[in-house]
């Protein structure tokens, strides 16, 4: 019989008494096959951490400090369930981190050296640790102590707690720093003031402070926040403008082996029996021997943490960061304006291989870090690991939602102006073999069929899409008998037609031979009946252009399109049966990472790009043999996007609603998990 | 101007070795890495193997566990060791430096 027992781990006699009290109301709630509750007494958050990855505990609750402490080696544990607040039709699990000016000061993020600041308290997350971490390698060196340095980077500041006698400067715009609200400048309310005040030129709050104090629109307008790009917005867009985002309160459990499933099904029920306005016996996020004992009093419930993320994607890079530049104190040489070498992402061993040659030829201006699949480096993209990719528009827009932007869009057609005008985008195709003369969109019903991968645009989110509108479910498994769409589940009769051996079957890469366009297209030619690829696909693989064994004899001719008013077409017509229109795959970075990304590319395909012509004797940075590595090979320049950039703008409102719809349908773990941090 | 000249090639029998070397006239050579590439008759040349400057070593797929690419910097050489090769590693082998022109490469023929 598996233990349904989780080990939750206590940090105060208040703590353990709370605890027992929940076992013992669990108990008589949950049948004695479902979960149960023991409790561990510890001396410290510290101590519970290690416990749990020792083995000797299995759950704690933590602030997002105490939340990277215990995601550092050797702990490794992961966030499972976090708390949220507000209401359960709008959860709030998060809070943003802010910087709030008054509007007509004409300052930016970088120009707070010699600004006076106004924080909630010294070593206080959203007040003193995110702004100064952030700020940390631009404050004047020595760096410690830490107070003196952030004394003489402003001219005067306001941190309750800090020590007035030491750093007097610290407490200049409020005498004492006294750190309770005897201080009038003390805490969230109290940083605000010192700001409205006059007293301060910018006040490290939390996005509800302003909302909390000013009730008035018309008063709140009259104050900006500063972005980390440089820029300013109103402060009602705090989610696209603050300094972090920040969870509140998390559970957390191993990484391995960590009990999360049952740790989810004991909150959840937890939750049910004793949650807000559950039960005057006993109240789950009630403390009346203390405040905030095991779960914060504030507490409305749980939310289950998606398996995909892990600590670093939850607590998000800005703030890990931050958290990293306070603990270990470690900065850059000298800051200087030079771009550092752009860390591309490479999947699987040959793009990896071909990343290492343009490392190689870019004389130290790129770097290569490997990953598995598309979502996985976007994932290191997201955390620093990694800063830029070229994504078909199916991942820009999961990389979007994950808080990544487009920075350049790959062009496939020559013209003279090519690196100023991105393009409207390519044509998603259905091919069929000629031969199969009676197959048209309306009878693809129990077909085999080959898609690029899943989530991609052509291969996937556009025929997909289209026959989901057709046939209003999801069990796309079951609509055809058999096809390869690499990314399925490894059991799924959408996997029974790939090529890849062993693990490497179905893998979304380059290891399994039917991945990408050309991959889809031999599918089609070697076993499947319809195969879902751009317009261009079928001319790059025909008539000898691509000397392949499999692909060296084939004829354009012996291929059609099929179009969606139920006729057929021959290839070159694609302009008047096509599925959709798909947006151009582009390149996608960090926000902070965005300027340098463009500049060090455009550089790039200056040396390596369309105007070198014997790419025999010269790296090609456009060209790899057919298999589109990096970048589609038919790529003739990446071009500047202009005003779109946003994965909204980039993609269009017609590409983003159909992909919005798919979402249903969704399998991918990385578009829930960073959901969960933006709905 | 630096040149690079390539040696080590010859006739081998299927299963046997050889080791080329890539020695760079001038200094600098290979800090930034320095990479072998084959062109066998009637095919694009293609990348085997690279080595940077900071050792890090990578190769393609069909010569990995049997190639090894190493470099002695104070000798302005790099080597390719290969080993059970096979007819398919036939081609003339060439080393490449960013900036350096191509060298006129080292013949390699595999055959029984």
């Known amino acids: 019989v598996p233990d349904k027992t989780v080990r939750w781990c206590a940090v105060s006699e208040h703590e353990a008494t709370k605890c027992q009290s929940f076992r013992d109301h669990m108990k008589s709630v949950i049948p004695s096959d479902g979960p149960s509750v023991a409790c561990v007494k510890k001396a410290s958050y510290l101590d519970c951490i290690r416990a749990i990855a020792a083995n000797e505990a299995d759950a704690v609750t933590l602030d997002a400090g105490l939340v990277y402490d215990a995601y550092l080696a050797p702990n490794n544990l992961k966030p499972v369930v976090a708390e949220f607040y507000g209401s359960k039709e709008d959860p709030q699990t998060f809070y943003y981190a802010v910087a709030v000016v008054k509007k007509d000061s004409g300052f930016q993020m970088n120009q707070l050296r010699g600004k006076k600041s106004c924080h909630t308290g010294l070593g206080r997350s959203a007040g003193w640790n995110i702004p100064i971490g952030l700020l940390y390698c631009d404050l004047p060196e020595p760096r410690k102590p830490l107070e003196k340095a952030v004394a003489n980077f402003f001219s005067g500041s306001c941190a309750p707690c800090a020590d007035g006698t030491d750093f007097p400067q610290l407490c200049q715009l409020c005498p004492g720093c006294g750190c309770s609200t005897l201080n009038q400048y003390f805490g969230y309310s109290g940083a605000f003031k010192c700001l409205k005040d006059g007293a301060g030129d910018v006040a490290f709050v939390k996005h509800s402070t302003i909302f909390e104090n000013l009730a008035n629109k018309a008063d709140r307008d009259q104050y900006e926040l500063l972005c980390l790009d440089n820029t300013r917005k109103p402060v009602d867009e705090y989610k696209d403008c603050h300094l972090a985002q920040v969870p509140s309160h998390t559970v957390v459990a191993r990484s391995m082996g960590g009990k999360e499933d049952l740790i989810w099904e004991l909150l959840n029920q937890a939750q049910e029996h004793f949650g807000k306005d559950k039960s005057k016996e006993f109240q789950l996020f009630s403390s009346p021997h203390g405040k905030d004992l095991l779960f914060k009093d504030s507490a409305h419930g749980f939310l289950k943490v998606p398996p995909r993320m892990d600590a670093k994607m939850y607590l998000g890079y800005e703030y890990v960061t931050a958290i990293r530049n306070l603990r270990e104190g470690t900065c850059p040489e000298a800051p200087t304006d030079e771009c550092k070498p752009v860390k591309w992402c490479a999947l699987s061993h040959h793009e990896r291989l071909k990343c290492d040659e343009w490392s190689v030829n870019s004389v130290g201006k790129i770097e290569c870090v490997s990953a598995e699949t598309t979502e996985d480096c976007i994932a290191k993209i997201m955390n620093g690991e990694a800063d830029a990719m070229s994504l078909d528009g199916g991942f820009v827009y999961i990389a979007g939602k994950c808080g990544l932007v487009p920075v350049l869009a790959e062009n496939y057609n020559k013209s003279d102006n090519c690196e100023d005008t991105p393009e409207a985008g390519y044509f998603a195709i259905a091919v069929v073999k000629k031969s199969a003369s009676d197959l048209t969109w309306d009878n693809l019903k129990g077909k085999k069929s080959c898609h690029t991968a899943v989530g991609r645009t052509a291969g996937w989110n556009i025929p997909m899409g289209l026959l989901y509108n057709k046939i209003n479910h999801c069990r796309f498994d079951e609509f055809f008998s058999e096809g390869c769409a690499p990314g399925s589940k490894k059991d799924s009769s959408l996997c029974k037609l790939c090529m890849g051996s062993g693990l490497n079957l179905c893998e979304p890469n380059n290891k399994e031979g039917y991945y990408g366009y050309t991959g889809a297209f031999r599918c089609l030619v070697e076993k499947g009946d319809v195969a879902f690829v751009k317009h261009q696909t079928v001319p790059q693989n025909t008539g000898g252009k691509n000397p392949d064994p499999w692909a060296k004899n084939l004829n354009e001719k012996d291929y059609e399109l099929l179009c969606l008013d139920g006729t057929r077409k021959p290839v070159e017509e694609y302009a008047n049966c096509h599925l959709a229109r798909a947006p151009n795959h582009a390149v996608v970075t960090r926000k902070d990472k965005e300027a340098c990304v463009h500049k060090i590319l455009r550089q790039q395909q200056h040396l390596f790009g369309s105007n070198v012509t014997d790419c025999s004797g010269n790296f090609c940075l456009f060209r790899s043999e057919t298999k589109d590595l990096l970048f589609r090979d038919d790529t003739v320049c990446l071009a500047k996007l202009h005003d779109r950039n946003t994965y909204e703008k980039y993609l269009g409102e017609e590409y983003v609603k159909a992909v919005g719809n798919l979402r249903k349908c969704s399998t991918s773990s990385l578009l829930e998990a960073c959901t969960f941090r933006r709905p | 101007q630096v040149q690079l000249v390539e040696s080590g090639g010859g006739l081998v029998q299927p299963g046997g070795s050889l080791r080329l070397s890539c020695v760079a006239s001038g200094s600098g050579f290979g800090i930034n890495g320095v990479i072998w590439y084959r062109q066998a008759p009637g095919k694009q040349r293609e990348l085997v193997a690279l080595?940077?400057?900071?050792?890090?070593?990578n190769y393609r797929e069909s010569v990995k566990g049997r190639f090894t690419i190493s470099r002695d910097d104070a000798k302005n050489t790099v080597w390719l060791q290969m080993s059970a090769l096979e007819p398919e590693d036939t081609g003339v082998y060439y080393c490449k430096t960013p900036g350096v022109p191509f060298g006129q490469g080292t013949q390699v023929t595999v055959s029984s």
């Open positions: 080595i940077k400057s900071d050792g890090y070593t």
